[in-house]
Interface confidence: low
């Protein structure tokens, strides 16, 4: 496929990635699907610099990122290693809280109003951020 050399319209370029910031809310799975349909993924935060950039654009609003533990351990949607990677959890988070009484725990991560991360019920309709990398093939290569 052809390589993407500039960001799509309405996306913001930063450090060789393109970011799109929603202004409405979706459940985590719906947000994840939205990004995939844009040939992107929910944002994967790999550094304090990237954290500050995203935080600046989303403001003090709960916003989904591409981090979840719905199938066991915490995983980034693009395969970035969670254990060795950047983290910015709120104190005492993630806590997989069951006390909300909504069924199950809390399996999806979001930016809170101060930018730090919290795990929450994946069905909540938060805003979200999509990310795609420049120089990435914009289409999957054909299967050989």
């Amino acid at each position: 496929g052809s390589e993407r050399t500039c960001c799509p319209v309405n996306w913001v370029e930063h450090e060789r990635s393109c970011y799109w910031f929603s202004r409405s809310g979706k459940a985590w799975a719906d947000a994840d699907n939205y990004c995939r349909l844009e040939d992107a993924h929910l944002v994967v935060v790999t550094s304090w610099e990237e954290q500050k950039f995203v935080q600046h654009h989303i403001g003090p609003v709960n916003t989904w990122m591409g981090l979840h533990d719905q199938n066991g351990p915490w995983k980034w949607v693009d395969g970035t290693d969670y254990e060795t990677g950047f983290k910015n959890w709120r104190p005492e988070q993630p806590d997989d809280w069951y006390g909300h009484g909504l069924g199950g725990g809390e399996d999806c991560a979001h930016f809170t109003d101060d930018g730090r991360w919290n795990d929450d019920v994946c069905q909540r309709p938060y805003r979200w951020v999509c990310e795609t990398e420049l120089d990435k093939a914009s289409q999957e290569p054909p299967l050989l």
Partner: antibody, heavy 114, light 107 residues
Framework: QVQLQQWGAGLLKPSETLSLTCAVY????????WTWIRQPPGKGLEWIGE???????NYNPSLKSRVTISVDTSKNQFSLKLSSVTAADTAVYYC????????WGQGTLVAVSA | DIQMTQSPSSLSASVGDRVTITCRAS??????LGWYQQKPGKAPKRLIY???SLQRGVPSRFSGSGSGTEFTLTISSLQPEDFATYYC?????????FGGGTKVEIK
């Protein structure tokens, strides 16, 4: 102890806009979604929609075109507006905490009559 | 939308009876279901969350079970204060939907 106290106009004419407010006392306001539910006289319960402290909303598609839910975090309050009401909107309207609905307001009877 | 079919719509029972109310979801909702009791002129009160967890302060004669599409509320020994209408609520998918209610009356 969490308490929800609600108020608003109880008698409306057709085509007017219903307006209710719910104040939250105790507990965390920012940690939850805040919900509106209604119950026509002698009938069952219907979920209207919800909002959180940052303004994210979710509405019942059956009412979405007429519903606005807003929030005032400085007062720990959230509000419901339902436009172009008809007799079919006559109901007791409840506010509740989150979509687990573990705490409820006392209810407000809203009657729509010409 | 997920339809919640509650049965029976009404029942007559005596104090001390064991009462069972069922909610059936039109599609799987895991255990994302609550049970509520409503008395005339009052707001509903949650009895059970996550299909089977007892709300704090609710008597242990109330219990919930089920997962997926079939859910049950059981009152092991009906007391005079239990005569009321009971509703289930699913919160797995938007819009949230209630069952039609079960009115428990004195026989």
């Amino acid at each position: 102890q969490v308490q929800l106290q609600q108020w608003g106009a109880g008698l409306l004419k057709p085509s007017e806009t219903l307006s209710l407010t719910c104040a939250v006392y105790g507990g965390s306001f920012s940690g939850y979604f805040w919900t509106w539910i209604r119950q026509p006289p002698g009938k069952g319960l219907e979920w209207i929609g919800e909002i959180n402290h940052s303004g994210s909303t979710n509405y019942n598609p059956s009412l979405k075109s007429r519903v606005t839910i807003s929030v005032d975090t400085s007062k720990n309050q959230f509000s419901l507006k339902l436009s172009s009401v008809t007799a079919a909107d006559t109901a007791v309207y409840y506010c509740a905490r989150d979509y687990g609905a573990d705490y409820w307001g006392q209810g407000t009877l809203v009657a729509v009559s010409a | 939308d997920i339809q919640m079919t509650q049965s029976p719509s009404s029942l007559s029972a005596s104090v001390g009876d064991r009462v069972t109310i069922t909610c059936r979801a039109s599609q799987g909702i895991r255990n994302d279901l609550g049970w509520y009791q409503q008395k005339p002129g009052k707001a509903p009160k949650r009895l059970i969350y996550s299909a089977s967890s007892l709300q704090r302060g609710v008597p242990s004669r109330f219990s919930g079970s089920g997962s997926g599409t079939e859910f049950t509320l059981t009152i092991s020994s009906l007391q005079p204060e239990d005569f009321a209408t009971y509703y289930c609520l699913q919160h797995k998918r938007y819009p949230l939907t209630f069952g039609g209610g079960t009115k428990v009356e004195i026989k």
